[in-house]
Interface confidence: medium
Amino acid sequence: RAQLERSLRDVVEKTIQKYGTNPEETAAEESWDYVQFQLRCCGWHYPQDWFQVLILRGNGSEAHRVPCSCYNLSATNDSTILDKVILPQLSRLGHLARSRHSADICAVPAESHIYREGCAQGLQKWLHNN
C-alpha cells in the first residue's frame, strides 16, 4: 500500500506540473479534476501546489489561478463566476466529458473560495478503505 501511495503521488505530481501544457493529452488532468471535484480538495498538499504551473501563476499582486475543479460551490456567492465559468466546467466533470476549454482555469478571487485542503489525506484514506 505504501508503494501504491508513493506511485500515486508521483503521478499526481507529474499531472500538476504538466497541467495544460498539452491539449492533446488531457486524460490524466481530467481524472485529477474529477478527484478534486469529488473529494472537495485542491492540489496534493495544498492549493498552492498549482502555483508552480507557469500558465497558472500570476505576478506578486495579481491573482493566481487554479483549475475550476478546486472551487467550493457552496462558498461562492458570485453568480457571474458561477454561471459563466465554474458551472459549465463542473457540469463537464459530472459527465466525465472529454472536452477542454480555457474556462477550465479560474482566477482565485479575493476571498479565495476554493477548497483549502489538499487531496493527499482524502486519497490516502480512500486507499486504506479499499
Epitope: 508552480q52 499582486s61 479565495s112
Partner: antibody, heavy 116, light 107 residues
Framework: EVQLVQSGAEVKKPGESLRISCKGS????????MNWVRQMPGKGLEWMGN????????TYNRKFKGQVTISADKSISTAYLQWSSLKASDTAMYYC?????????WGRGTLVTVSS | DIQMTQSPASLSASVGETVTITCRTS??????LAWYQQKQGKSPQLLVS???TLAEGVPSRFSGSGSGTQFSLKISSLQPEDSGSYFC?????????FGGGTELEIK
Amino acid sequence: EVQLVQSGAEVKKPGESLRISCKGSGYSFTGYNMNWVRQMPGKGLEWMGNIDPYYGGTTYNRKFKGQVTISADKSISTAYLQWSSLKASDTAMYYCARSVGPMDYWGRGTLVTVSS
Amino acid sequence: DIQMTQSPASLSASVGETVTITCRTSENVYSYLAWYQQKQGKSPQLLVSFAKTLAEGVPSRFSGSGSGTQFSLKISSLQPEDSGSYFCQHHSDNPWTFGGGTELEIK
C-alpha cells in the same frame, strides 16, 4: 506592490508577554498563508508555523507548539505572533513571510531581545 | 522531520566564476524545494521555487535543478552583489525545514 510591514524591535524581560505584528498590503491578504520564521543571532532559519487568514486555521512546527500563538485579523490584513511568557532563549529576529507554497515575500523582521 | 543537508557551508569565488550549492533531503520532497538568498542584516529573498522556477526579478544567472532528494543551485558569471548566505527549504510536509546555509564570499 506587495509589502509586509512588521512592528518595531522589542526589549523584554523573562516572563513578560509580547505580541508582534505583520501587516500585508498590495495583495489579497486572505488568499495566502502567513508564516513566521525565527532566526537566532548568527544562526540559520527555522519555520515556526503559519496561518490561513481566511479561515483562521493554524499549522505549527512541533518545536514551537505551545510556546507561541499565531493569529490574524483579516479585517486589518494583519498577522500576529504572541508569547505569554518570554524566555531568554526567545531572543531572535522574527520574520513574517507570505506563502504560495514557498515563501515569496518577506517582512523586514522584528528583533526581539529578552534579557533580565 | 525532513532533514536538509546543505553543502558547502562556505565558499569563496571570484567575479565571473560559476558556483554550485547542493542540498540533500532525508526524504523525497519531489519538486517542493525553494532557494533563498539572505544578505547581511536583510530578510531572505526567494530565488527559486518548486526546485527550478526562477522567482520574479531574479537574474537568469541563477538556476535551480533536481528533484526527489538531490537539488542544486547554480550561480554562473558571479557578480559582487551575489555575496551573502543561501538557504534551501522544503515546502512539502510539515514542518517545513531549512538547510544550514551556505556563506558565499566574492573575492
